[in-house]
Interface confidence: low
């Protein structure tokens, strides 16, 4: 990226751009990682790998887990299946809006949207409509920073995921993720 | 150094069009958002459109949506503000604005701070 | 469409005094939210983004802060430069709205 002429901003933690790159990062390797696990490579997916430092990788393996929990969660999958892909960015904005439409944020909340969004790219790709793996991502960045970056500064950043899910009962925080994307595609159903 | 430089304006009819250009220095076009932003005469800002040019995504204001375009030209890094049907309630400063940079490529419509703008430029719209 | 309901639409201080202008949002806007600087005939200045951080060479004295659906541009101790008019900017869901401006003046 040609970044001249940009000054650099704070970089701690629970700053903007901090929370805004790390969760970049997350949301690129989570993406990368369930697609990897359809077999086969998906070049639409080969975006450049970033570095990540060690706290970005036990976020990554944090979010990994709950992804494969998700993914055997029968019911969440049926849902998502039954999604209609011909206006993706309505869908995604509607069901994104309504995870959090009750003005409680959790951070099992943020990750059901992270894998809400990794199910509309692995859509999108059995469909063939690569162009809108990046513009999803786009969507769910933009989702983050305009509804969801103000609470992650309060959680003191992204490290307070893994305390979130670092406990024994992280199954059944699962659960409950899976019971709020659940949720929010069937009101999207009832509304579509 | 980043510079925006804005052009086209100018005195136009009722009904006319105008094609106001942004000319960006300094920075890619492509990883940015660019805005456009109005003035009327002794009131306050008003945002009219944006784009992210790296998904060709454009968002408007109701006021001018139908009427007005924006397009980027990447090879040219210039930003475009095509106005149809001009009304005299157009009649304002127009600037174009830089908005947040994308992240590893892949930012979003980047509706965001504007951190640098250009010095506008006046569009009248009278008979 | 979010609203931004800025307030005081006009203020007279003295150099040296504490100023404080806030934004309602109509509704959540979480940290989009921007402070820009206007002086007449020129065009605005980003001051600060994420409702809270400062701008690169931004002064000190100028800091944003965030209670629910209210956002407040502080300058801590305002100087003569400072005289001009303040404009709050949301951004939600790619539509931008801007506040309708708070002009600061010699008293």
């Known amino acids: 990226m040609d970044g001249s002429g940009e000054q650099p901003r704070g970089g701690g933690p629970t700053s903007s751009e901090q929370i805004m790159k790390t969760g970049a990062l997350l949301l690129q390797g989570f993406i990368q990682d369930r697609a990897g696990r359809m077999g086969g490579e998906a070049p639409e997916l080969a975006l450049d790998p970033v570095p990540q430092d060690a706290s970005t990788k036990k976020l990554s393996e944090c979010l990994k887990r709950i992804g494969d929990e998700l993914d055997s969660n029968m019911e969440l999958q049926r849902m998502i299946a039954a999604v209609d892909t011909d206006s993706p960015r309505e869908v995604f904005f509607r069901v994104a809006a309504d995870m959090f439409s009750d003005g409680n944020f959790n951070w099992g909340r943020v990750v059901a949207l992270f894998y809400f969004a990794s199910k509309l790219v692995l859509k999108a790709l059995c469909t063939k409509v690569p162009e809108l793996i990046r513009t999803i991502m786009g969507w769910t960045l933009d989702f983050l920073r305009e509804r969801l970056l103000g609470w992650i500064q309060d959680q003191g950043g992204w490290d307070g995921l893994l305390s979130y899910f670092g406990t024994p009962t992280w199954q059944t925080v699962t659960i409950f993720v899976a019971g709020v994307l659940t949720a929010s595609l069937t009101i999207w159903k009832k509304m579509g | 150094e980043v510079q925006l430089v804005e052009s086209g304006g100018g005195l136009v009819q009722p009904g006319g069009s105008l094609r106001l250009s942004c000319a960006a220095s300094?920075?890619?076009?492509?990883?940015?958002?660019m805005h456009w932003v109005r003035q009327a005469p002794g009131k306050g800002l008003e945002w009219v459109a944006s784009?992210?040019?790296?998904?060709?995504?454009?968002y408007y204001a109701d006021s001018v949506k139908g009427r007005f375009t924006i397009s980027a030209d990447t090879s040219k890094n210039t930003a475009y503000l095509q106005m149809n049907s001009l009304r005299a309630e157009d009649t304002a400063v127009y600037y174009c604005?830089?908005?947040?940079?994308?992240?590893?490529?892949?930012?979003?419509?980047?509706?965001?701070?504007?951190?640098?703008w250009g010095q506008g430029t006046l569009v009248t719209v009278s008979s | 469409d979010i609203q931004m309901t800025q307030s005081p639409s006009s203020l007279s201080a003295s150099v040296g005094d504490r100023v404080t202008i806030t934004c309602r949002a109509s509704?959540?806007?979480?940290?989009?939210v921007a402070w820009y600087q206007q002086k007449p005939g020129k065009a605005p200045k980003l001051l600060i983004y994420?409702?809270?951080s400062l701008y690169s060479g931004v002064p000190s004295r100028f800091s944003g802060s965030r209670s629910g659906t209210d956002f407040t541009l502080t300058i801590s101790s305002l100087q003569p430069e400072d005289f001009a008019t303040y404009y709050c900017?949301?951004?939600?869901?790619?539509?931008?709205?801007f506040g309708q401006g708070t002009k600061v003046e010699i008293k």
């Open positions: 604005a830089r908005g947040g940079a994308y992240y590893f490529g892949y930012y979003g419509s980047g509706s965001y701070a504007m951190d640098y």
């Open positions: 300094g920075f890619n076009l492509s990883y940015y958002s």
């Open positions: 784009i992210s040019p790296y998904y060709g995504y454009t």
């Open positions: 509704q959540s806007v979480s940290s989009a």
């Open positions: 994420s409702a809270s």
């Open positions: 900017q949301q951004s939600s869901y790619s539509l931008i709205t």
